[in-house]
């Protein structure tokens, strides 16, 4: 048993039929010695008396909020949560496997630049009675600070008959140098509690591997005289690391017809302009990627040809 | 993805082209190692990230762009002697770059060159003949070192009398390639920055 936060404890259980469970001793936080009684989840059934209560925790029926009382007055509470281990594997019932980039991916993270700021998100089909807390560090044996905000519900989506809830959190490495070469990964740890069930999820990554620039900005077309060609120009996104001559981007320019089946023309360039042929009803899109380290491409920025 | 090949103008900062070739070569070699050594721990998640130049060179700090010198997190061990020799500077005056930066890059290349050559000698003795270092990568390292044109003592190639452990050698190759790729990215960024200065 270990303390998750004040008055909240996690009991780790091997989960199989007729498992013996864990013996837990609860102590009432009071100077009182006599006349103390214990209840579970504010039911009227008295579980025991005395300053300590010994319980055998085997299943969810044994978890919950234990309260010690004296003469109708509440003295203290202890909330017991369960962390299930089945066949040697901790349960992952609360979050959805996003299966990208590989199976058992519960947390996904992205950074818009090398500033040490990143966002992580996760999915669940659970709508209420759910709390998350997020911790992060650089490295694990001698951890360096990363500060994370509170996880918030960032999106709700309908998937077939079911609703899916996306939560996200923003974190910032306390002392990040954008030019640094990372040798220790960022560790992100999410504690998830659904009713009386506790689970934890982790992700480990280098900022360089989760970079996804914002789309190029100010995408503009300039028709070239007496030609079907246009000069497309754009700028680095505002959120990208500076100086741009050090943190350089490369770009992909795509001409796409109205129909998805039409052949796409693609040009790759390190410049912030390109000359392409603009077909009728087509659109021109540009996306960006770190020029030297091939992490994710940005989303497309698009303009119509007309 | 193949990085776009830049054809430098005669007046262009001469090392940019070489550094781009270096990054392309090390990225290709790393990809080849990952594929060939698929049953070895050779991915970024699996390996220990070791830097053989740690405490010997200070490339990141020495080559920091001026704009980042205001960032205290980047300044833990910043040296500030501004000098401008080395042929890559091609008589450009620059307040950003110091000889320390280019010589630090040169020292990095020299260290990796020695390590790779030693390792290749071991890999050539492997009866499985599973993987060898790409000669192109070694050549590109050499070309960039020549372009940098720093004179320094030759580091003797390490020779080892004991029987090589080929499994360990291949793991070390992965570690080395990952670290060298990261350093090659830094070198490319530096050269790009210098070229724009």
């Amino acid at each position: 048993i270990w303390e998750l936060k004040k008055d909240v404890y996690v009991v780790e259980l091997d989960w199989y039929p007729d498992a013996p469970g864990e013996m837990v001793v609860l102590t009432c936080d009071t100077p009182e010695e006599d006349g103390i009684t214990w209840t579970l989840d504010q039911s009227s059934e008295v579980l025991g008396s005395g300053k300590t209560l010994t319980i055998q925790v085997k299943e969810f029926g044994d978890a919950g909020q234990y309260t010690c009382h004296k003469g109708g007055e509440v003295l203290s509470h202890s909330l017991l949560l369960l962390h299930k281990k089945e066949d040697g594997i901790w349960s992952t019932d609360i979050l959805k496997d996003q299966k990208e980039p590989k199976n058992k991916t519960f947390l996904r993270c992205e950074a818009k630049n090398y500033s040490g700021r990143f966002t992580c998100w996760w999915l669940t089909t659970i709508s209420t009675d759910l709390t998350f807390s997020v911790k992060s560090s650089r490295g694990s044996s001698d951890p360096q600070g990363v500060t994370c905000g509170a996880a918030t519900l960032s999106a709700e989506r309908v998937r077939g008959d079911n609703k899916e809830y996306e939560y996200s959190v923003e974190c910032q490495e306390d002392s990040a140098c954008p030019a640094a070469e990372e040798s220790l990964p960022i560790e992100v740890m999410v504690d998830a509690v659904h009713k009386l069930k506790y689970e934890n999820y982790t992700s480990s990554f280098f900022i360089r591997d989760i970079i996804k620039p914002d789309p190029p900005k100010n995408l503009q077309l300039k028709p070239l005289k007496n030609s079907r060609q246009v000069e497309v120009s754009w700028e680095y996104p505002d959120t990208w690391s500076t100086p741009h001559s050090y943190f350089s981007l490369t770009f992909c320019v795509q001409v796409q017809g109205k129909s998805k089946r039409e052949k796409k023309d693609r040009v790759f360039t390190d410049k912030t302009s390109a000359t392409v042929i603009c077909r009728k009803n087509a659109s021109i899109s540009v996306r960006a990627q770190d020029r030297y380290y091939s992490s994710s491409w940005s989303e497309w920025a698009s303009v119509p040809c007309s | 993805r193949n990085l776009p090949v830049a054809t430098p103008d005669p007046g262009m900062f001469p090392c940019l082209h070489h550094s781009q070739n270096l990054l392309r070569a090390v990225s290709n070699m790393l990809q080849k190692a990952r594929q060939t050594l698929e049953f070895y721990p050779c991915t970024s998640e699996e390996i220990d990230h070791e830097d053989i130049t740690k405490d010997k060179t200070s490339t990141v700090e020495a080559c920091l762009p001026l704009e980042l010198t205001k960032n205290e997190s980047c300044l833990n061990s910043r040296e500030t002697s501004f000098i401008t020799n080395g042929s890559c500077l091609a008589s450009r005056k620059t307040s950003f770059m110091m000889a320390l930066c280019l010589s630090s890059i040169y020292e990095d290349l020299k260290m990796y060159q020695v390590e790779f050559k030693t390792m290749n000698a071991k890999l050539l003795m492997d009866p499985k003949r599973q993987i060898f270092l790409d000669q192109n990568m070694l050549a590109v390292i050499d070309e960039l070192m020549q372009a940098l044109n720093f004179n320094s003592e030759t580091v003797p190639q390490k020779s080892s009398l004991e029987e090589p452990d080929f499994y360990k050698t291949k793991i070390k190759l992965c570690i080395l390639l990952h670290a060298f790729r990261i350093r090659a990215v830094t070198i490319d960024r530096v050269m790009s920055y210098l070229n724009a200065s």
Epitope: Q42, G64, Q65, I126, T128 | -
Partner: antibody, heavy 117, light 107 residues
């Protein structure tokens, strides 16, 4: 002892509103959700929504959104469920129940609402 | 929305016999399932929560099992006071949903 006591039966005309109360005693009101469940004559149970006074959260069944409002008064430990624009098919017994970790463990006695012109 | 489907709709059993009631969820609800008993003119009464945990004061002839999408309520030896309607309910994801109910009647 935990108890949930509901207000008495109501007869309403179509288009009118009804507000049912549920007074909770014997436990810390703020620690639990009060859920509202209805049962039309001879039918099964249908969940309408819930209200947590502790967190100020509501959780409504989409089917009743816009027509139902759930509130509470912590000074009297009383929860309320108001249903507007009543129709004849809203004729049912309306139950309040407390919920936290163990399902809906205590229920009110039910309030019969009859909608008839 | 998660749909809970109970079967059979009616179960005719003699006193002293075993009754097995089934409940299927349209998607996984982990073990967040409760079972309720309702007698005519009364409010429902909680029997089982977290799929297999007997609520305080519920006789041990009642037992629940299952996780994911398939759940079972078993009454090992029916007593006269057990003839009633039984509902399963998921509170894994909102909107909470009840099954249509299984009426256990005297054979």
């Amino acid at each position: 002892e935990v108890q949930l006591v509901q207000s008495g039966a109501e007869v309403k005309k179509p288009g009118a509103s009804v507000k049912v109360s549920c007074k909770a005693t014997g436990y810390t009101f703020n620690d639990y959700w009060i859920e509202w469940v209805r049962q039309a004559p001879g039918q099964g149970l249908e969940w309408m929504g819930g209200f947590s006074h502790g967190s100020g959260s509501t959780n409504y069944n989409e089917k009743f959104k816009g027509r139902v409002t759930m509130t509470a008064d912590s000074s009297t430990n009383t929860a309320y469920m108001e249903l507007r624009s009543l129709r004849s098919d809203d004729t049912a017994v309306y139950y309040c129940a407390r919920r936290r970790f163990r399902g809906m463990d205590y229920w009110g006695q039910g309030t019969t609402v009859t909608v008839s012109s | 929305e998660i749909v809970m489907t109970q079967s059979p709709a009616t179960l005719s059993v003699s006193p002293g016999e075993r009754a097995t009631l089934s409940c299927k969820a349209s998607q996984s609800v982990s073990n967040d399932v409760a079972w309720y008993q309702q007698k005519p003119g009364q409010a429902p009464r909680l029997l089982i929560y977290y799929a297999s945990n007997r609520y305080t004061g519920v006789p041990d002839r009642f037992s629940g099992s299952g996780s994911g999408t398939e759940f079972t309520l078993t009454i090992s030896s029916l007593q006269s006071e057990d003839f009633a309607v039984y509902y399963c309910q998921q509170d894994y994801s909102s909107p909470w949903s009840f099954g249509g109910g299984t009426k256990v009647e005297i054979k």
